[in-house]
Protein backbone atom coordinates (compact mmCIF):
# COMPACT_ATOMS: atom_id res chain seq x y z
CA UNK A 1 0.00 0.00 0.00
CA UNK A 2 1.20 3.58 -0.66
CA UNK A 3 1.04 6.61 1.50
CA UNK A 4 -0.63 9.66 -0.64
CA UNK A 5 2.06 12.19 -1.29
CA UNK A 6 1.31 15.82 -2.31
CA UNK A 7 -0.03 15.17 -6.21
CA UNK A 8 -0.40 11.65 -6.18
CA UNK A 9 -3.56 10.34 -7.99
CA UNK A 10 -2.95 6.91 -7.54
CA UNK A 11 -4.91 4.49 -4.78
CA UNK A 12 -3.28 5.57 -1.67
CA UNK A 13 -3.52 5.73 1.85
CA UNK A 14 -4.58 9.24 3.00
CA UNK A 15 -4.04 10.26 6.95
CA UNK A 16 -6.64 11.67 8.85
CA UNK A 17 -7.67 12.34 12.10
CA UNK A 18 -11.04 11.88 13.20
CA UNK A 19 -12.65 14.15 15.98
CA UNK A 20 -15.05 12.60 17.54
CA UNK A 21 -16.76 15.53 18.83
CA UNK A 22 -16.75 17.03 15.42
CA UNK A 23 -19.11 14.75 14.54
CA UNK A 24 -20.83 14.53 17.60
CA UNK A 25 -20.55 11.62 19.44
CA UNK A 26 -18.47 12.57 21.92
CA UNK A 27 -21.53 11.87 23.80
CA UNK A 28 -21.67 8.00 23.50
CA UNK A 29 -17.75 7.65 22.90
CA UNK A 30 -15.74 8.33 26.48
CA UNK A 31 -12.07 7.17 25.07
CA UNK A 32 -10.61 8.32 22.89
CA UNK A 33 -11.78 11.78 21.77
CA UNK A 34 -10.96 10.75 18.34
CA UNK A 35 -8.09 8.77 16.27
CA UNK A 36 -6.40 8.60 13.31
CA UNK A 37 -8.77 7.00 11.31
CA UNK A 38 -7.42 7.74 7.58
CA UNK A 39 -8.63 6.61 4.16
CA UNK A 40 -8.24 5.45 0.87
CA UNK A 41 -8.53 7.71 -2.36
CA UNK A 42 -7.69 7.49 -5.91
CA UNK A 43 -7.53 6.10 -9.45
CA UNK A 44 -7.40 2.30 -9.91
CA UNK A 45 -6.70 2.51 -13.84
CA UNK A 46 -7.18 -1.41 -15.00
CA UNK A 47 -3.37 -1.66 -15.88
CA UNK A 48 -2.59 -0.94 -12.11
CA UNK A 49 -5.38 -2.27 -10.72
CA UNK A 50 -3.67 -5.61 -10.79
CA UNK A 51 -0.46 -5.27 -10.12
CA UNK A 52 0.68 -7.28 -6.76
CA UNK A 53 1.02 -4.64 -3.86
CA UNK A 54 -1.73 -2.53 -5.58
CA UNK A 55 -4.17 -5.04 -5.71
CA UNK A 56 -6.20 -5.80 -2.90
CA UNK A 57 -6.38 -9.92 -3.38
CA UNK A 58 -5.58 -12.39 -5.43
CA UNK A 59 -9.44 -12.34 -6.31
CA UNK A 60 -8.93 -8.93 -7.58
CA UNK A 61 -5.67 -9.82 -9.84
CA UNK A 62 -7.48 -12.41 -11.50
CA UNK A 63 -11.04 -10.56 -12.26
CA UNK A 64 -8.70 -7.20 -13.41
CA UNK A 65 -7.31 -9.66 -15.67
CA UNK A 66 -10.75 -11.07 -17.02
CA UNK A 67 -11.55 -7.39 -17.69
CA UNK A 68 -8.40 -6.74 -19.39
CA UNK A 69 -9.21 -9.77 -21.65
CA UNK A 70 -13.24 -9.40 -22.17
CA UNK A 71 -15.61 -7.11 -23.10
CA UNK A 72 -16.08 -4.21 -20.53
CA UNK A 73 -18.76 -4.95 -17.92
CA UNK A 74 -18.92 -8.65 -18.08
CA UNK A 75 -17.19 -8.92 -14.51
CA UNK A 76 -18.90 -6.07 -12.42
CA UNK A 77 -17.66 -2.08 -12.25
CA UNK A 78 -14.76 -0.01 -12.08
CA UNK A 79 -12.08 -1.25 -9.99
CA UNK A 80 -12.07 0.64 -6.17
CA UNK A 81 -9.50 2.38 -4.08
CA UNK A 82 -10.74 0.52 -0.82
CA UNK A 83 -8.63 -0.28 2.38
CA UNK A 84 -6.96 -3.42 2.16
CA UNK A 85 -5.30 -3.38 5.89
CA UNK A 86 -6.92 -2.50 9.28
CA UNK A 87 -6.65 -3.05 12.46
CA UNK A 88 -8.67 -2.73 15.80
CA UNK A 89 -8.97 -0.04 18.34
CA UNK A 90 -9.73 0.01 21.87
CA UNK A 91 -12.91 2.27 22.57
CA UNK A 92 -14.82 3.21 25.91
CA UNK A 93 -18.05 4.07 25.67
CA UNK A 94 -21.77 3.76 27.09
CA UNK A 95 -23.59 1.40 25.78
CA UNK A 96 -27.67 1.13 25.11
CA UNK A 97 -28.06 0.92 28.87
CA UNK A 98 -25.72 3.29 30.03
CA UNK A 99 -23.13 0.82 31.20
CA UNK A 100 -19.69 1.60 30.37
CA UNK A 101 -17.99 -0.79 28.37
CA UNK A 102 -14.46 -1.41 27.14
CA UNK A 103 -14.04 -3.14 23.28
CA UNK A 104 -11.56 -3.51 20.58
CA UNK A 105 -13.60 -2.50 17.49
CA UNK A 106 -12.01 -4.50 14.09
CA UNK A 107 -11.40 -2.30 11.34
CA UNK A 108 -10.99 1.12 13.21
CA UNK A 109 -7.68 1.92 11.28
CA UNK A 110 -6.87 2.13 7.68
CA UNK A 111 -2.87 0.57 7.22
CA UNK A 112 -3.09 -0.09 3.71
CA UNK A 113 -5.33 0.62 0.52
CA UNK A 114 -5.56 -0.76 -2.86
CA UNK A 115 -8.22 -1.45 -5.73
CA UNK A 116 -10.65 -4.00 -5.33
CA UNK B 1 -24.45 -9.04 2.15
CA UNK B 2 -27.15 -9.71 -0.57
CA UNK B 3 -27.02 -12.02 -3.05
CA UNK B 4 -27.69 -10.66 -6.53
CA UNK B 5 -30.93 -11.71 -7.82
CA UNK B 6 -31.61 -9.42 -11.01
CA UNK B 7 -34.32 -7.62 -9.00
CA UNK B 8 -32.00 -5.33 -6.96
CA UNK B 9 -29.70 -2.70 -8.24
CA UNK B 10 -28.10 -2.41 -4.62
CA UNK B 11 -24.71 -3.62 -3.96
CA UNK B 12 -24.87 -7.36 -3.93
CA UNK B 13 -23.10 -10.64 -4.67
CA UNK B 14 -23.00 -11.79 -8.32
CA UNK B 15 -21.69 -15.43 -8.63
CA UNK B 16 -19.27 -16.16 -11.21
CA UNK B 17 -16.82 -19.03 -12.20
CA UNK B 18 -13.23 -18.14 -13.56
CA UNK B 19 -11.53 -20.69 -15.63
CA UNK B 20 -7.89 -20.12 -15.33
CA UNK B 21 -7.34 -21.32 -18.69
CA UNK B 22 -9.27 -17.99 -19.76
CA UNK B 23 -6.87 -16.13 -18.23
CA UNK B 24 -3.59 -17.80 -19.02
CA UNK B 25 -2.96 -19.56 -15.73
CA UNK B 26 -3.19 -22.90 -16.43
CA UNK B 27 0.20 -23.25 -17.10
CA UNK B 28 1.01 -22.83 -13.47
CA UNK B 29 -2.19 -23.63 -11.69
CA UNK B 30 -2.48 -27.52 -11.49
CA UNK B 31 -5.53 -27.67 -9.91
CA UNK B 32 -8.19 -26.73 -9.75
CA UNK B 33 -8.95 -25.96 -13.33
CA UNK B 34 -11.03 -22.78 -12.17
CA UNK B 35 -13.58 -21.85 -9.26
CA UNK B 36 -16.14 -19.38 -8.22
CA UNK B 37 -14.35 -16.25 -7.56
CA UNK B 38 -17.31 -14.15 -7.60
CA UNK B 39 -17.81 -10.68 -7.46
CA UNK B 40 -19.49 -7.38 -6.46
CA UNK B 41 -21.55 -5.31 -8.28
CA UNK B 42 -24.52 -2.78 -7.60
CA UNK B 43 -24.88 0.68 -6.26
CA UNK B 44 -23.95 1.88 -3.29
CA UNK B 45 -26.05 5.23 -2.70
CA UNK B 46 -25.06 7.49 0.31
CA UNK B 47 -28.04 6.42 2.44
CA UNK B 48 -27.04 2.73 2.39
CA UNK B 49 -23.53 3.49 2.24
CA UNK B 50 -23.57 3.51 6.23
CA UNK B 51 -25.58 0.84 7.05
CA UNK B 52 -24.84 -2.56 9.35
CA UNK B 53 -25.23 -5.34 6.68
CA UNK B 54 -24.26 -3.37 3.79
CA UNK B 55 -21.37 -1.21 4.71
CA UNK B 56 -18.05 -2.09 5.66
CA UNK B 57 -17.35 -1.35 9.09
CA UNK B 58 -17.30 1.50 11.65
CA UNK B 59 -14.93 2.90 9.22
CA UNK B 60 -16.96 3.37 6.66
CA UNK B 61 -19.97 4.74 9.00
CA UNK B 62 -17.44 6.94 9.96
CA UNK B 63 -16.69 8.49 6.27
CA UNK B 64 -20.32 8.22 5.56
CA UNK B 65 -21.07 10.94 8.50
CA UNK B 66 -18.58 13.43 6.42
CA UNK B 67 -19.38 12.62 2.93
CA UNK B 68 -23.12 13.19 4.22
CA UNK B 69 -22.56 16.54 5.31
CA UNK B 70 -20.29 17.50 2.38
CA UNK B 71 -16.90 17.70 4.44
CA UNK B 72 -13.80 17.97 2.30
CA UNK B 73 -12.01 15.64 1.46
CA UNK B 74 -15.06 12.85 1.47
CA UNK B 75 -17.31 14.95 -0.53
CA UNK B 76 -16.24 13.49 -3.23
CA UNK B 77 -15.09 10.39 -2.07
CA UNK B 78 -17.25 7.68 -4.28
CA UNK B 79 -18.45 4.71 -1.86
CA UNK B 80 -17.98 0.82 -3.83
CA UNK B 81 -19.18 -2.18 -3.89
CA UNK B 82 -16.53 -4.46 -2.67
CA UNK B 83 -15.88 -7.98 -1.01
CA UNK B 84 -16.40 -7.79 3.06
CA UNK B 85 -15.80 -11.35 3.26
CA UNK B 86 -13.38 -13.21 1.74
CA UNK B 87 -12.47 -17.08 2.14
CA UNK B 88 -9.60 -18.91 1.48
CA UNK B 89 -8.78 -21.99 -1.21
CA UNK B 90 -6.35 -24.70 -1.58
CA UNK B 91 -4.52 -24.56 -5.01
CA UNK B 92 -1.99 -26.79 -6.48
CA UNK B 93 0.30 -24.91 -8.21
CA UNK B 94 4.37 -24.70 -9.50
CA UNK B 95 6.62 -22.16 -8.09
CA UNK B 96 9.57 -20.57 -9.27
CA UNK B 97 11.75 -23.23 -8.89
CA UNK B 98 9.17 -25.60 -10.79
CA UNK B 99 8.20 -27.37 -7.70
CA UNK B 100 4.41 -28.16 -6.76
CA UNK B 101 2.96 -26.22 -4.31
CA UNK B 102 0.01 -27.12 -2.57
CA UNK B 103 -1.06 -23.90 -0.44
CA UNK B 104 -4.75 -22.17 0.98
CA UNK B 105 -4.72 -19.01 -1.00
CA UNK B 106 -6.25 -16.21 0.54
CA UNK B 107 -9.14 -13.91 -0.27
CA UNK B 108 -9.87 -15.99 -3.72
CA UNK B 109 -13.38 -16.41 -2.72
CA UNK B 110 -15.92 -13.41 -2.28
CA UNK B 111 -18.55 -14.33 0.30
CA UNK B 112 -20.33 -11.40 0.84
CA UNK B 113 -20.13 -7.79 -0.28
CA UNK B 114 -20.67 -4.01 1.06
CA UNK B 115 -20.15 -0.77 0.59
CA UNK B 116 -16.79 0.99 1.47
CA UNK C 1 -14.49 -26.21 9.19
CA UNK C 2 -14.68 -28.63 6.37
CA UNK C 3 -17.26 -31.69 7.40
CA UNK C 4 -18.16 -34.37 6.14
CA UNK C 5 -20.93 -36.72 6.98
CA UNK C 6 -22.14 -40.00 5.54
CA UNK C 7 -25.05 -41.64 5.80
CA UNK C 8 -27.19 -44.57 4.64
CA UNK C 9 -25.30 -47.62 5.28
CA UNK C 10 -26.79 -50.34 6.83
CA UNK C 11 -27.36 -54.30 6.45
CA UNK C 12 -28.27 -54.96 3.10
CA UNK C 13 -29.14 -58.62 1.46
CA UNK C 14 -27.23 -59.05 -1.77
CA UNK C 15 -29.40 -58.23 -4.79
CA UNK C 16 -30.81 -55.39 -3.24
CA UNK C 17 -30.29 -51.61 -3.09
CA UNK C 18 -29.23 -48.97 -0.82
CA UNK C 19 -28.47 -44.99 -1.42
CA UNK C 20 -25.55 -43.53 0.08
CA UNK C 21 -25.70 -39.80 0.81
CA UNK C 22 -22.58 -37.10 2.31
CA UNK C 23 -23.51 -33.64 3.66
CA UNK C 24 -20.88 -31.25 3.21
CA UNK C 25 -19.96 -28.21 5.03
CA UNK C 26 -17.37 -25.63 5.57
CA UNK C 27 -15.83 -25.14 2.07
CA UNK C 28 -17.54 -24.00 -1.45
CA UNK C 29 -19.16 -27.51 -2.58
CA UNK C 30 -19.22 -26.54 -6.28
CA UNK C 31 -15.68 -26.01 -6.68
CA UNK C 32 -14.89 -29.04 -6.39
CA UNK C 33 -14.89 -33.10 -7.50
CA UNK C 34 -15.72 -35.68 -4.91
CA UNK C 35 -15.05 -38.97 -4.79
CA UNK C 36 -16.48 -42.71 -2.58
CA UNK C 37 -13.66 -44.21 -1.48
CA UNK C 38 -14.48 -47.98 0.05
CA UNK C 39 -12.17 -49.97 2.56
CA UNK C 40 -13.45 -53.48 3.09
CA UNK C 41 -12.21 -55.09 6.78
CA UNK C 42 -9.14 -55.45 7.30
CA UNK C 43 -8.05 -54.66 4.09
CA UNK C 44 -6.88 -51.86 2.10
CA UNK C 45 -8.77 -48.24 -0.14
CA UNK C 46 -10.15 -48.51 -2.56
CA UNK C 47 -11.83 -46.14 -4.92
CA UNK C 48 -14.85 -46.75 -5.93
CA UNK C 49 -16.37 -43.33 -8.02
CA UNK C 50 -15.75 -39.32 -8.58
CA UNK C 51 -18.02 -36.48 -9.89
CA UNK C 52 -16.61 -33.30 -11.62
CA UNK C 53 -17.60 -30.14 -9.67
CA UNK C 54 -20.61 -29.58 -12.40
CA UNK C 55 -21.27 -33.21 -12.81
CA UNK C 56 -20.19 -33.24 -16.28
CA UNK C 57 -17.23 -35.71 -16.42
CA UNK C 58 -17.87 -39.53 -13.76
CA UNK C 59 -15.81 -42.20 -13.38
CA UNK C 60 -16.26 -45.38 -11.75
CA UNK C 61 -14.32 -48.42 -10.56
CA UNK C 62 -14.24 -51.43 -13.23
CA UNK C 63 -15.91 -53.39 -10.04
CA UNK C 64 -18.81 -51.49 -9.44
CA UNK C 65 -19.43 -49.80 -13.82
CA UNK C 66 -23.04 -50.25 -14.31
CA UNK C 67 -24.44 -51.09 -10.52
CA UNK C 68 -23.60 -47.90 -8.79
CA UNK C 69 -24.35 -44.16 -9.67
CA UNK C 70 -22.59 -41.31 -8.32
CA UNK C 71 -24.09 -37.96 -8.25
CA UNK C 72 -24.25 -34.51 -6.48
CA UNK C 73 -26.55 -31.51 -5.61
CA UNK C 74 -24.54 -28.12 -5.86
CA UNK C 75 -27.51 -26.86 -4.00
CA UNK C 76 -27.76 -28.79 -1.15
CA UNK C 77 -24.35 -29.06 -1.03
CA UNK C 78 -24.66 -33.26 -1.16
CA UNK C 79 -23.08 -36.10 -2.69
CA UNK C 80 -24.84 -39.72 -3.17
CA UNK C 81 -23.97 -42.94 -4.48
CA UNK C 82 -26.79 -45.19 -5.73
CA UNK C 83 -25.85 -48.70 -5.32
CA UNK C 84 -27.80 -51.33 -7.08
CA UNK C 85 -27.40 -55.31 -7.39
CA UNK C 86 -25.21 -55.20 -4.16
CA UNK C 87 -22.74 -58.39 -3.65
CA UNK C 88 -20.83 -59.32 -0.06
CA UNK C 89 -17.96 -58.27 -2.35
CA UNK C 90 -19.76 -54.72 -1.59
CA UNK C 91 -19.32 -54.73 2.30
CA UNK C 92 -16.69 -51.95 3.84
CA UNK C 93 -16.87 -48.55 4.54
CA UNK C 94 -17.79 -46.13 2.17
CA UNK C 95 -15.54 -42.48 2.41
CA UNK C 96 -17.33 -39.26 0.97
CA UNK C 97 -13.94 -37.52 -0.03
CA UNK C 98 -13.39 -34.05 -1.11
CA UNK C 99 -10.95 -33.49 -4.22
CA UNK C 100 -8.76 -30.53 -4.35
CA UNK C 101 -9.36 -30.32 -7.86
CA UNK C 102 -12.42 -29.87 -9.21
CA UNK C 103 -12.39 -32.02 -12.56
CA UNK C 104 -11.52 -35.60 -12.51
CA UNK C 105 -8.48 -35.29 -14.49
CA UNK C 106 -5.62 -33.16 -14.09
CA UNK C 107 -4.68 -33.82 -10.21
CA UNK C 108 -7.41 -35.56 -8.14
CA UNK C 109 -5.84 -35.32 -4.11
CA UNK C 110 -8.16 -36.02 -1.22
CA UNK C 111 -8.06 -33.05 1.17
CA UNK C 112 -10.40 -34.26 3.65
CA UNK C 113 -12.67 -37.14 4.40
CA UNK C 114 -15.37 -38.16 6.08
CA UNK C 115 -15.64 -40.80 9.10
CA UNK C 116 -17.53 -43.01 6.91
CA UNK C 117 -20.71 -45.60 6.46
CA UNK C 118 -20.84 -49.04 6.98
CA UNK C 119 -22.14 -51.11 4.25
CA UNK C 120 -22.66 -54.77 4.82
CA UNK C 121 -24.17 -57.05 2.72
CA UNK C 122 -24.82 -60.02 3.66
CA UNK C 123 -27.89 -63.29 3.58
CA UNK D 1 -5.03 -48.85 -15.80
CA UNK D 2 -2.17 -48.21 -13.66
CA UNK D 3 -1.15 -50.52 -10.58
CA UNK D 4 0.54 -49.16 -7.68
CA UNK D 5 2.65 -51.99 -5.68
CA UNK D 6 3.38 -51.21 -1.91
CA UNK D 7 6.17 -53.04 0.23
CA UNK D 8 6.50 -54.12 2.10
CA UNK D 9 3.09 -55.12 3.15
CA UNK D 10 3.86 -54.96 6.86
CA UNK D 11 6.65 -53.71 8.89
CA UNK D 12 7.66 -54.02 12.64
CA UNK D 13 10.11 -51.26 13.63
CA UNK D 14 10.83 -49.23 17.41
CA UNK D 15 10.52 -45.87 18.53
CA UNK D 16 13.65 -44.00 17.26
CA UNK D 17 13.97 -46.05 13.94
CA UNK D 18 14.33 -44.95 10.65
CA UNK D 19 11.76 -46.64 8.29
CA UNK D 20 11.65 -46.56 4.40
CA UNK D 21 8.52 -47.73 2.52
CA UNK D 22 8.50 -47.97 -1.12
CA UNK D 23 5.84 -47.86 -3.85
CA UNK D 24 6.36 -48.97 -7.82
CA UNK D 25 3.77 -47.77 -10.52
CA UNK D 26 3.39 -49.98 -13.49
CA UNK D 27 3.76 -47.18 -15.70
CA UNK D 28 5.54 -43.92 -15.37
CA UNK D 29 3.65 -41.37 -13.41
CA UNK D 30 6.08 -38.72 -13.20
CA UNK D 31 5.81 -37.27 -9.46
CA UNK D 32 2.07 -37.53 -9.39
CA UNK D 33 1.94 -39.41 -6.26
CA UNK D 34 0.76 -39.04 -3.02
CA UNK D 35 1.01 -40.67 0.50
CA UNK D 36 -1.55 -41.34 3.14
CA UNK D 37 -1.38 -42.24 6.90
CA UNK D 38 -4.31 -44.33 8.07
CA UNK D 39 -4.85 -45.10 12.19
CA UNK D 40 -7.02 -47.77 13.41
CA UNK D 41 -10.79 -46.23 13.48
CA UNK D 42 -10.04 -43.11 11.73
CA UNK D 43 -10.23 -41.77 8.07
CA UNK D 44 -7.03 -41.73 5.99
CA UNK D 45 -4.86 -38.39 6.17
CA UNK D 46 -3.00 -36.74 3.89
CA UNK D 47 1.06 -36.90 4.67
CA UNK D 48 2.91 -36.05 1.24
CA UNK D 49 1.51 -34.92 -2.32
CA UNK D 50 3.92 -34.29 -5.86
CA UNK D 51 5.89 -37.37 -4.53
CA UNK D 52 8.47 -35.38 -1.81
CA UNK D 53 6.06 -32.34 -1.07
CA UNK D 54 4.86 -31.92 2.86
CA UNK D 55 1.17 -31.24 3.53
CA UNK D 56 1.07 -28.76 6.11
CA UNK D 57 1.03 -29.62 9.98
CA UNK D 58 2.85 -32.92 8.69
CA UNK D 59 5.61 -33.73 10.93
CA UNK D 60 9.13 -32.54 9.20
CA UNK D 61 10.45 -36.45 10.18
CA UNK D 62 7.92 -37.97 6.97
CA UNK D 63 10.04 -37.37 3.61
CA UNK D 64 8.94 -38.79 0.16
CA UNK D 65 11.12 -39.02 -3.02
CA UNK D 66 11.24 -40.57 -6.33
CA UNK D 67 9.58 -40.06 -9.93
CA UNK D 68 8.95 -41.91 -12.93
CA UNK D 69 7.88 -45.51 -11.12
CA UNK D 70 9.42 -45.76 -7.74
CA UNK D 71 9.22 -43.65 -4.77
CA UNK D 72 10.14 -43.78 -1.05
CA UNK D 73 8.28 -42.91 2.05
CA UNK D 74 10.88 -42.06 5.05
CA UNK D 75 10.37 -41.94 8.36
CA UNK D 76 13.47 -40.52 9.88
CA UNK D 77 12.65 -41.04 13.57
CA UNK D 78 9.65 -43.07 14.73
CA UNK D 79 7.78 -41.75 17.38
CA UNK D 80 4.81 -43.86 18.96
CA UNK D 81 2.09 -41.56 16.90
CA UNK D 82 3.49 -42.65 13.79
CA UNK D 83 2.68 -45.96 13.84
CA UNK D 84 -0.34 -47.00 11.32
CA UNK D 85 -1.05 -47.73 7.90
CA UNK D 86 -0.17 -45.86 4.62
CA UNK D 87 -0.98 -45.95 1.18
CA UNK D 88 0.50 -44.89 -1.88
CA UNK D 89 -1.71 -42.74 -4.39
CA UNK D 90 -1.18 -42.44 -7.99
CA UNK D 91 -2.91 -39.38 -9.22
CA UNK D 92 -1.39 -39.38 -13.06
CA UNK D 93 -4.06 -41.23 -15.17
CA UNK D 94 -7.29 -40.72 -13.81
CA UNK D 95 -10.07 -41.91 -13.68
CA UNK D 96 -9.47 -44.60 -12.33
CA UNK D 97 -7.54 -43.02 -9.25
CA UNK D 98 -5.87 -46.29 -7.78
CA UNK D 99 -4.05 -46.83 -4.35
CA UNK D 100 -1.44 -49.11 -3.46
CA UNK D 101 -2.50 -51.83 -1.08
CA UNK D 102 -0.99 -50.62 2.15
CA UNK D 103 1.94 -50.83 4.71
CA UNK D 104 1.30 -51.88 8.10
CA UNK D 105 3.79 -50.40 10.38
CA UNK D 106 3.63 -51.87 13.91
CA UNK D 107 5.52 -51.73 16.98
CA UNK D 108 8.22 -54.32 17.29
Known amino acids: GIDCQGGSRMCCRQEFFVDFREIGWHDWIIQPEGYAMNFCIGQCPLHIAGMPGIAASFHTAVLNLLKANTAAGTTGGGSCCVPTARRPLSLLYYDRDSNIVKTDIPDMVVEACGCS | GLECDGKVNICCKKQFFVSFKDIGWNDWIIAPSGYHANYCEGECPSHIAGTSGSSLSFHSTVINHYRMRGHSPFANLKSCCVPTKLRPMSMLYYDDGQNIIKKDIQNMIVEECGCS | EVQLVESGGGLVQPGRSLTLSCAVSGFTFDDHAMHWVRQAPGKGLEWVSG????????GYADSVKGRFTISRDNAKTSLYLQMNSLRVDDTALYYCVQDLNDILTGYPLFDFWGQGTLVTVSS | DIQMTQSPSSLSASVGDRVTITCRAS??????LNWYQQKPGKAPKLLIY???SLQSGVPSRFSGSGSGTDFTLTISSLQPEDFATYYCQQSYSTPPITFGQGTRLEIK
Open chain 4, 27 to 32: QSISSY
Open chain 4, 50 to 52: AAS
Open chain 3, 51 to 58: ISWNSVSI
